[in-house]
Protein backbone atom coordinates (compact mmCIF):
# COMPACT_ATOMS: atom_id res chain seq x y z
CA UNK A 1 0.00 0.00 0.00
CA UNK A 2 1.43 3.35 -1.03
CA UNK A 3 1.16 6.03 1.19
CA UNK A 4 2.61 9.22 -1.13
CA UNK A 5 3.66 13.01 -0.50
CA UNK A 6 1.22 15.51 0.23
CA UNK A 7 -0.48 18.29 -2.47
CA UNK A 8 -0.76 21.25 -0.50
CA UNK A 9 -3.78 23.07 0.28
CA UNK A 10 -5.07 26.16 2.27
CA UNK A 11 -8.74 25.12 3.10
CA UNK A 12 -10.14 23.97 5.92
CA UNK A 13 -9.90 20.01 6.54
CA UNK A 14 -12.19 18.91 4.00
CA UNK A 15 -12.57 15.23 4.62
CA UNK A 16 -14.56 16.42 7.90
CA UNK A 17 -16.98 17.70 5.46
CA UNK A 18 -16.89 14.77 3.84
CA UNK A 19 -17.41 12.49 6.86
CA UNK A 20 -20.32 14.56 8.32
CA UNK A 21 -22.32 13.53 4.45
CA UNK A 22 -21.26 10.41 5.06
CA UNK A 23 -22.44 9.96 8.18
CA UNK A 24 -25.87 11.78 7.08
CA UNK A 25 -26.03 9.73 4.03
CA UNK A 26 -25.61 6.33 5.28
CA UNK A 27 -28.26 7.29 8.47
CA UNK A 28 -31.00 7.99 5.98
CA UNK A 29 -30.06 5.19 3.64
CA UNK A 30 -30.72 2.58 6.75
CA UNK A 31 -33.81 4.93 8.20
CA UNK A 32 -35.16 4.52 3.99
CA UNK A 33 -34.19 0.61 4.82
CA UNK A 34 -36.23 -0.05 7.95
CA UNK A 35 -39.24 1.81 6.56
CA UNK A 36 -39.29 -0.30 3.40
CA UNK A 37 -37.85 -3.79 4.88
CA UNK A 38 -40.39 -3.66 7.25
CA UNK A 39 -41.06 -7.61 7.09
CA UNK A 40 -36.90 -8.33 7.36
CA UNK A 41 -35.21 -7.33 11.09
CA UNK A 42 -33.90 -4.41 9.93
CA UNK A 43 -33.61 -2.49 13.21
CA UNK A 44 -30.76 -2.06 15.58
CA UNK A 45 -32.34 -4.10 18.07
CA UNK A 46 -32.64 -7.10 15.72
CA UNK A 47 -29.46 -7.08 13.77
CA UNK A 48 -26.57 -8.73 13.92
CA UNK A 49 -23.68 -6.19 14.18
CA UNK A 50 -21.32 -8.18 11.64
CA UNK A 51 -18.23 -6.36 9.90
CA UNK A 52 -16.88 -7.05 6.57
CA UNK A 53 -14.12 -5.41 7.14
CA UNK A 54 -13.22 -8.27 10.31
CA UNK A 55 -8.98 -9.46 10.03
CA UNK A 56 -9.23 -7.33 6.32
CA UNK A 57 -8.61 -4.06 7.95
CA UNK A 58 -7.41 -2.45 11.45
CA UNK A 59 -9.22 0.80 11.36
CA UNK A 60 -10.31 0.90 14.95
CA UNK A 61 -6.83 -0.29 16.16
CA UNK A 62 -4.62 2.04 13.74
CA UNK A 63 -7.24 5.16 14.66
CA UNK A 64 -7.39 4.61 18.34
CA UNK A 65 -3.80 5.87 19.33
CA UNK A 66 -4.61 9.36 17.61
CA UNK A 67 -6.86 10.09 20.18
CA UNK A 68 -4.96 8.51 22.91
CA UNK A 69 -1.84 10.07 22.00
CA UNK A 70 -2.87 14.07 21.37
CA UNK A 71 0.54 14.78 21.67
CA UNK A 72 1.55 12.33 19.82
CA UNK A 73 4.69 11.98 22.00
CA UNK A 74 5.05 8.17 21.24
CA UNK A 75 4.79 8.65 17.73
CA UNK A 76 7.70 10.75 17.08
CA UNK A 77 10.31 9.13 16.15
CA UNK A 78 8.06 7.65 13.19
CA UNK A 79 6.59 10.96 12.35
CA UNK A 80 7.09 11.82 9.32
CA UNK A 81 6.02 14.24 6.40
CA UNK A 82 4.40 12.13 3.60
CA UNK A 83 0.65 11.96 3.76
CA UNK A 84 -1.83 11.14 0.83
CA UNK A 85 -1.95 12.71 -2.29
CA UNK A 86 -6.01 14.05 -1.49
CA UNK A 87 -7.58 17.20 0.35
CA UNK A 88 -7.61 15.33 3.52
CA UNK A 89 -4.40 16.07 5.31
CA UNK A 90 -2.67 18.43 2.56
CA UNK A 91 0.07 20.87 4.14
CA UNK A 92 0.32 18.21 7.19
CA UNK A 93 2.94 17.20 8.99
CA UNK A 94 1.56 13.41 9.68
CA UNK A 95 2.90 10.40 12.17
CA UNK A 96 3.16 7.33 10.51
CA UNK A 97 -0.21 5.77 12.88
CA UNK A 98 -2.28 9.31 10.69
CA UNK A 99 -1.29 7.79 8.06
CA UNK A 100 -1.79 4.43 8.50
CA UNK A 101 -5.55 5.36 10.12
CA UNK A 102 -6.32 6.99 6.80
CA UNK A 103 -5.31 4.12 4.69
CA UNK A 104 -7.35 1.95 6.19
CA UNK A 105 -10.45 4.16 6.40
CA UNK A 106 -9.86 4.77 2.53
CA UNK A 107 -10.05 0.44 2.57
CA UNK A 108 -12.79 0.09 4.70
CA UNK A 109 -14.63 2.31 2.26
CA UNK A 110 -13.66 0.74 -0.87
CA UNK A 111 -14.91 -2.69 0.80
CA UNK A 112 -18.15 -1.33 1.16
CA UNK A 113 -18.45 0.44 -1.76
CA UNK A 114 -17.78 -3.05 -3.62
CA UNK A 115 -20.61 -4.57 -1.88
CA UNK A 116 -23.20 -1.72 -1.93
CA UNK A 117 -22.92 -1.53 -5.51
CA UNK A 118 -22.91 -5.61 -5.63
CA UNK A 119 -26.15 -5.32 -4.20
CA UNK A 120 -27.60 -2.46 -5.83
CA UNK A 121 -27.27 -4.23 -9.36
CA UNK A 122 -29.01 -7.03 -7.64
CA UNK A 123 -31.61 -5.29 -6.17
CA UNK A 124 -32.03 -3.02 -9.42
CA UNK A 125 -33.17 -6.85 -11.19
CA UNK A 126 -35.56 -7.51 -8.54
CA UNK A 127 -39.05 -7.68 -9.90
CA UNK A 128 -40.60 -6.21 -6.72
CA UNK A 129 -38.87 -3.27 -6.99
CA UNK A 130 -38.72 -2.58 -3.66
CA UNK A 131 -35.55 -0.61 -2.73
CA UNK A 132 -32.26 0.49 -3.94
CA UNK A 133 -29.59 1.84 -2.92
CA UNK A 134 -29.42 5.75 -2.43
CA UNK A 135 -26.98 7.28 -4.97
CA UNK A 136 -26.23 10.14 -3.09
CA UNK A 137 -24.66 7.91 -0.54
CA UNK A 138 -22.89 6.17 -3.23
CA UNK A 139 -21.32 9.53 -4.11
CA UNK A 140 -20.58 10.73 -1.04
CA UNK A 141 -18.38 7.27 -0.37
CA UNK A 142 -16.89 8.19 -3.79
CA UNK A 143 -16.18 11.84 -2.86
CA UNK A 144 -14.53 10.50 0.71
CA UNK A 145 -11.92 8.07 -1.10
CA UNK A 146 -11.33 11.08 -4.07
CA UNK A 147 -10.38 13.49 -0.99
CA UNK A 148 -8.17 10.60 0.65
CA UNK A 149 -6.93 9.61 -2.64
CA UNK A 150 -4.39 7.17 -1.61
CA UNK A 151 -2.50 4.73 -4.44
CA UNK A 152 -4.79 1.53 -4.52
CA UNK A 153 -5.50 -1.24 -6.70
CA UNK A 154 -8.98 -1.03 -7.77
CA UNK A 155 -11.52 -3.75 -6.92
CA UNK A 156 -13.70 -5.17 -9.59
CA UNK A 157 -17.04 -4.71 -9.09
CA UNK A 158 -18.03 -8.32 -8.66
CA UNK A 159 -19.97 -9.54 -11.25
CA UNK A 160 -22.46 -12.85 -10.95
CA UNK A 161 -23.67 -14.64 -14.22
CA UNK A 162 -25.82 -16.51 -10.79
CA UNK A 163 -29.38 -15.37 -10.78
CA UNK A 164 -29.72 -13.09 -7.76
CA UNK A 165 -30.65 -14.08 -4.33
CA UNK A 166 -33.02 -11.26 -3.39
CA UNK A 167 -34.18 -12.62 -0.08
CA UNK A 168 -30.66 -12.97 0.88
CA UNK A 169 -29.34 -9.73 -0.53
CA UNK A 170 -31.97 -7.60 1.34
CA UNK A 171 -30.94 -9.40 4.78
CA UNK A 172 -27.38 -8.88 3.98
CA UNK A 173 -28.34 -5.31 2.97
CA UNK A 174 -29.63 -4.63 5.98
CA UNK A 175 -26.64 -6.05 7.98
CA UNK A 176 -24.05 -4.20 5.91
CA UNK A 177 -26.14 -0.86 6.52
CA UNK A 178 -25.96 -0.99 10.06
CA UNK A 179 -21.88 -2.00 9.93
CA UNK A 180 -21.70 0.84 7.90
CA UNK A 181 -23.03 3.55 9.65
CA UNK A 182 -21.17 2.32 13.47
CA UNK A 183 -18.30 2.52 10.89
CA UNK A 184 -19.31 5.81 9.83
CA UNK A 185 -19.18 7.56 13.26
CA UNK A 186 -15.81 5.76 13.74
CA UNK A 187 -14.13 7.68 10.41
CA UNK A 188 -16.79 10.57 11.39
CA UNK A 189 -14.91 10.84 14.75
CA UNK A 190 -11.52 10.23 13.22
CA UNK A 191 -11.71 13.41 11.00
CA UNK A 192 -13.35 15.61 13.91
CA UNK A 193 -10.16 14.75 16.39
CA UNK A 194 -7.63 15.58 13.05
CA UNK A 195 -9.58 19.03 12.40
CA UNK A 196 -9.54 20.19 16.16
CA UNK A 197 -6.05 19.26 15.73
CA UNK B 1 -11.59 -23.65 10.47
CA UNK B 2 -15.20 -23.52 10.52
CA UNK B 3 -16.81 -26.97 10.15
CA UNK B 4 -20.88 -27.03 9.51
CA UNK B 5 -22.17 -30.31 9.69
CA UNK B 6 -25.96 -31.01 8.42
CA UNK B 7 -28.03 -34.17 8.90
CA UNK B 8 -31.50 -35.07 9.14
CA UNK B 9 -32.25 -35.28 5.72
CA UNK B 10 -33.75 -38.29 4.20
CA UNK B 11 -36.92 -39.49 1.87
CA UNK B 12 -40.36 -38.57 2.73
CA UNK B 13 -43.61 -38.87 1.31
CA UNK B 14 -45.90 -35.19 0.26
CA UNK B 15 -47.29 -33.86 3.05
CA UNK B 16 -44.42 -35.46 5.45
CA UNK B 17 -41.70 -33.58 7.64
CA UNK B 18 -38.39 -33.70 8.72
CA UNK B 19 -36.32 -31.86 11.03
CA UNK B 20 -32.87 -30.79 9.93
CA UNK B 21 -29.69 -30.05 12.48
CA UNK B 22 -26.69 -28.17 12.38
CA UNK B 23 -23.70 -28.37 13.59
CA UNK B 24 -21.51 -25.42 13.80
CA UNK B 25 -17.83 -24.79 14.94
CA UNK B 26 -14.51 -22.92 14.26
CA UNK B 27 -14.81 -18.97 13.51
CA UNK B 28 -18.84 -19.49 13.62
CA UNK B 29 -19.72 -17.12 16.42
CA UNK B 30 -23.39 -17.16 18.56
CA UNK B 31 -23.24 -13.80 17.74
CA UNK B 32 -23.91 -14.05 13.49
CA UNK B 33 -26.90 -14.42 11.54
CA UNK B 34 -27.38 -18.06 10.16
CA UNK B 35 -29.71 -19.25 7.69
CA UNK B 36 -30.75 -22.35 5.99
CA UNK B 37 -30.01 -22.91 2.03
CA UNK B 38 -30.85 -25.09 -0.47
CA UNK B 39 -29.73 -26.28 -3.90
CA UNK B 40 -32.34 -27.87 -6.39
CA UNK B 41 -31.08 -30.04 -9.01
CA UNK B 42 -29.54 -28.35 -12.10
CA UNK B 43 -29.26 -24.56 -10.14
CA UNK B 44 -27.66 -22.27 -7.82
CA UNK B 45 -28.07 -22.42 -3.80
CA UNK B 46 -30.08 -20.18 -2.28
CA UNK B 47 -31.37 -18.72 1.29
CA UNK B 48 -34.50 -19.91 2.39
CA UNK B 49 -34.69 -19.01 6.10
CA UNK B 50 -32.69 -16.87 8.32
CA UNK B 51 -32.42 -16.28 11.61
CA UNK B 52 -30.48 -13.44 14.15
CA UNK B 53 -28.50 -14.20 16.91
CA UNK B 54 -31.45 -13.06 19.02
CA UNK B 55 -33.65 -15.22 17.74
CA UNK B 56 -35.62 -13.12 14.57
CA UNK B 57 -36.34 -15.24 12.03
CA UNK B 58 -37.40 -14.32 8.13
CA UNK B 59 -38.51 -17.14 5.19
CA UNK B 60 -38.60 -17.12 1.47
CA UNK B 61 -41.52 -16.60 0.53
CA UNK B 62 -42.10 -20.10 -1.11
CA UNK B 63 -41.24 -21.65 2.26
CA UNK B 64 -43.35 -19.59 4.20
CA UNK B 65 -45.59 -21.09 7.00
CA UNK B 66 -44.27 -24.65 6.37
CA UNK B 67 -40.90 -24.33 7.62
CA UNK B 68 -39.29 -22.90 10.84
CA UNK B 69 -35.38 -22.13 11.76
CA UNK B 70 -34.54 -22.15 14.95
CA UNK B 71 -31.05 -22.04 17.07
CA UNK B 72 -29.21 -23.18 20.29
CA UNK B 73 -26.58 -20.35 21.00
CA UNK B 74 -25.15 -22.30 23.50
CA UNK B 75 -25.10 -25.81 21.50
CA UNK B 76 -24.12 -23.60 18.80
CA UNK B 77 -26.50 -25.43 16.50
CA UNK B 78 -29.60 -24.14 13.70
CA UNK B 79 -32.39 -26.35 12.82
CA UNK B 80 -34.41 -26.43 10.22
CA UNK B 81 -37.95 -27.92 10.85
CA UNK B 82 -40.06 -28.94 7.37
CA UNK B 83 -43.55 -29.64 7.32
CA UNK B 84 -46.06 -30.38 4.29
CA UNK B 85 -43.57 -31.40 2.20
CA UNK B 86 -43.90 -31.17 -1.55
CA UNK B 87 -41.81 -33.23 -4.38
CA UNK B 88 -40.57 -29.12 -5.27
CA UNK B 89 -38.36 -28.91 -1.69
CA UNK B 90 -36.14 -32.15 -3.39
CA UNK B 91 -32.88 -30.68 -2.97
CA UNK B 92 -29.54 -30.53 -0.75
CA UNK B 93 -30.11 -28.24 2.15
CA UNK B 94 -27.42 -26.75 3.35
CA UNK B 95 -26.59 -24.04 6.47
CA UNK B 96 -24.20 -21.14 6.72
CA UNK B 97 -23.96 -18.13 8.30
CA UNK B 98 -25.13 -15.00 6.05
CA UNK B 99 -21.95 -12.79 5.29
CA UNK B 100 -18.47 -14.57 5.29
CA UNK B 101 -20.15 -17.56 4.01
CA UNK B 102 -16.92 -19.31 2.74
CA UNK B 103 -16.76 -22.41 4.06
CA UNK B 104 -19.35 -24.84 3.20
CA UNK B 105 -19.95 -28.42 4.76
CA UNK B 106 -21.57 -31.32 2.93
CA UNK B 107 -25.11 -30.97 3.04
CA UNK B 108 -28.24 -33.04 3.55
CA UNK B 109 -30.22 -34.67 0.97
CA UNK B 110 -33.74 -34.64 1.56
CA UNK B 111 -36.32 -36.48 -1.53
CA UNK B 112 -40.01 -35.78 -1.14
CA UNK B 113 -41.68 -38.18 -3.22
CA UNK B 114 -44.25 -41.02 -3.34
Known amino acids: RNLPVATPDPGMFPCLHHSQNLLRAVSNMLQKARQTLEFYPCTSEEIDHEDITKDKTSTVEACLPLELTKNESCLNSRETSFITNGSCLASRKTSFMMALCLSSIYEDLKMYQVEFKTMNAKLLMDPKRQIFLDQNMLAVIDELMQALNFNSETVPQKSSLEEPDFYKTKIKLCILLHAFRIRAVTIDRVMSYLNAS | EVQLVESGGGLVQPGGSLRLTCAASGSIASNSAMGWYRQLPGKQRELIAH???????TYADFVKGRFTISRDNVKNMVYLQMNSLKPEDTAVYYC????????WGQGTQVTVSS
Open chain 2, 96 to 103: NKILHSDY
Open chain 2, 51 to 57: ITSRGHT
